[in-house]
Interface confidence: low
């Protein structure tokens, strides 16, 4: 499989772009809306009838260095006696970003794009019932 | 910036903080194909709170395409298959990073960009604050 | 508490257009979603518009491209501009939002509102 390239031929080279060497890319870490505001609805994880608890996982040697994960409570869902209805299914809702990782080799550092997986809360579906010949 | 634990035999000029600038090979390493969201899962049709998958491009950044969720319903789908308006279908949002061209139609320069998704849905009881 | 008015609904003929409007008024500290469902006699009440307080729309299949929803935030107002109208749109209009509001001093972050409904028919 191909790993994806970010540079795109069909993009007219400007000439104010800044001279980058071949095989790499110049990236400013510098977060562009980094101060704006998550406006969701308060604690849905544990309002949801597919409930979600969240960990956060700490890289030094990744940026962003914390990346949040939710975990689906149950296997079911949650139904009005609040109790766990089986018959449905929690499952999780996935979404990929991008990081960016440092790698050592020695005393010299380089640098790499990584997209991860980021599990971001949990809905409760209908289960896919196949049925054995 | 964040810390980094240095092999105590390298000089001293290595600076512990991720730089402001930093030069980035062009593959991006990853073990997750960009597919479609209505390929990779069906969860959107099949949730007691679906949504629709809407398409948002956009050539000065990558990835490129970004898939946007939207809650079908106000309610969420019962058992019978009906809407229950007792209950709220509510969109999942997280912010992610994406690389913006910067200077604009740069083919390899770029900054980081975060921005906020909704991922898809899910069905939630409305809440009450009691304000004293 | 929240209220949710409609206006707007009347007869029109097959082809022409109508414009609903639906204005939400009360203690509200926010507005999520606002939107129109329909319902047919001895059909159930289904999805017509929804816009987002991001600006994006949604709408059933069987009006695109016909129907366009607008909003007013500073008025909390929604409209449905209705052309091309059909027999098979004839249907009580209902406006509903999901709200953030306080009411009796308790603040209830997102629950979902409606409105008494609109008679639209449209004659052929």
């Known amino acids: 499989r191909k790993i994806p390239k970010v540079g795109h031929t069909f993009f007219q080279k400007p000439e104010s772009c800044p001279p980058v060497p071949g095989g790499s890319m110049k990236l400013d870490i510098g977060i562009i809306n980094e101060n704006q505001r998550v406006s969701m609805s308060r604690n849905i994880e544990s309002r949801s009838t597919s409930p979600w608890n969240y960990t956060v996982t700490w890289d030094p040697n990744r940026y962003p260095s914390e990346v949040v994960q939710a975990q689906c409570r149950n296997l079911g869902c949650i139904n009005a006696q609040g109790k766990e209805d089986i018959s449905m299914n929690s499952v999780p809702i996935q979404q990929e970003t991008l990081v960016v990782r440092r790698k050592h080799q020695g005393c010299s550092v380089s640098f790499q794009l990584e997209k991860v997986l980021v599990t971001v809360g949990c809905t409760c579906v209908t289960p896919v019932i196949h049925h054995v010949q | 910036g964040i810390t980094i634990p240095r092999n105590p035999g390298c000089p001293n000029s290595e600076d512990k903080n991720f730089p402001r600038t930093v030069m980035v090979n062009l593959n991006i390493h990853n073990r997750n194909t960009n597919t479609n969201p209505k390929r990779s899962s069906d969860y959107y049709n099949r949730s007691t709170s679906p949504w629709n998958l809407h398409r948002n491009e956009d050539p000065e950044r990558y990835p490129s395409v970004i898939w946007e969720a939207k809650c079908r319903h106000l309610g969420c789908i019962n058992a019978d298959g009906n809407v229950d308006y007792h209950m709220n279908s509510v969109p999942i949002q997280q912010e992610i990073l994406v690389l913006r061209r910067e200077p604009p139609h740069c083919p390899n320069s770029f900054r980081l960009e975060k921005i906020l998704v909704s991922v898809g849905c899910t069905c939630v009881t409305p809440i009450v604050h009691h304000v004293a | 508490e929240v209220q949710l008015v409609e206006s707007g609904g009347g007869l029109v003929q097959a082809g022409g257009s109508q414009r609903l409007s639906c204005t939400a008024s009360?203690?509200?500290?926010?507005?999520?979603?606002m939107g129109w469902y329909r319902q047919a006699p001895g059909k159930q009440r289904e999805l017509v518009a929804l816009i987002f307080s991001g600006g994006s729309a949604d709408y059933a299949d069987s009006v695109k491209g016909r129907f366009t929803i607008s909003r007013d935030n500073a008025k909390n107002t929604v409209y449905l501009e209705m052309n091309s109208l059909k027999a098979e749109d004839t249907a009580v209009y209902y406006c509903a939002a999901e709200i953030g509001y306080y009411s009796g001093g308790t603040y209830y972050s997102s629950e979902a509102h409606w409105g008494q409904g609109t008679q639209v028919t449209v004659s052929s």
């Open positions: 009360g203690t509200i500290v926010n507005i999520h979603v």
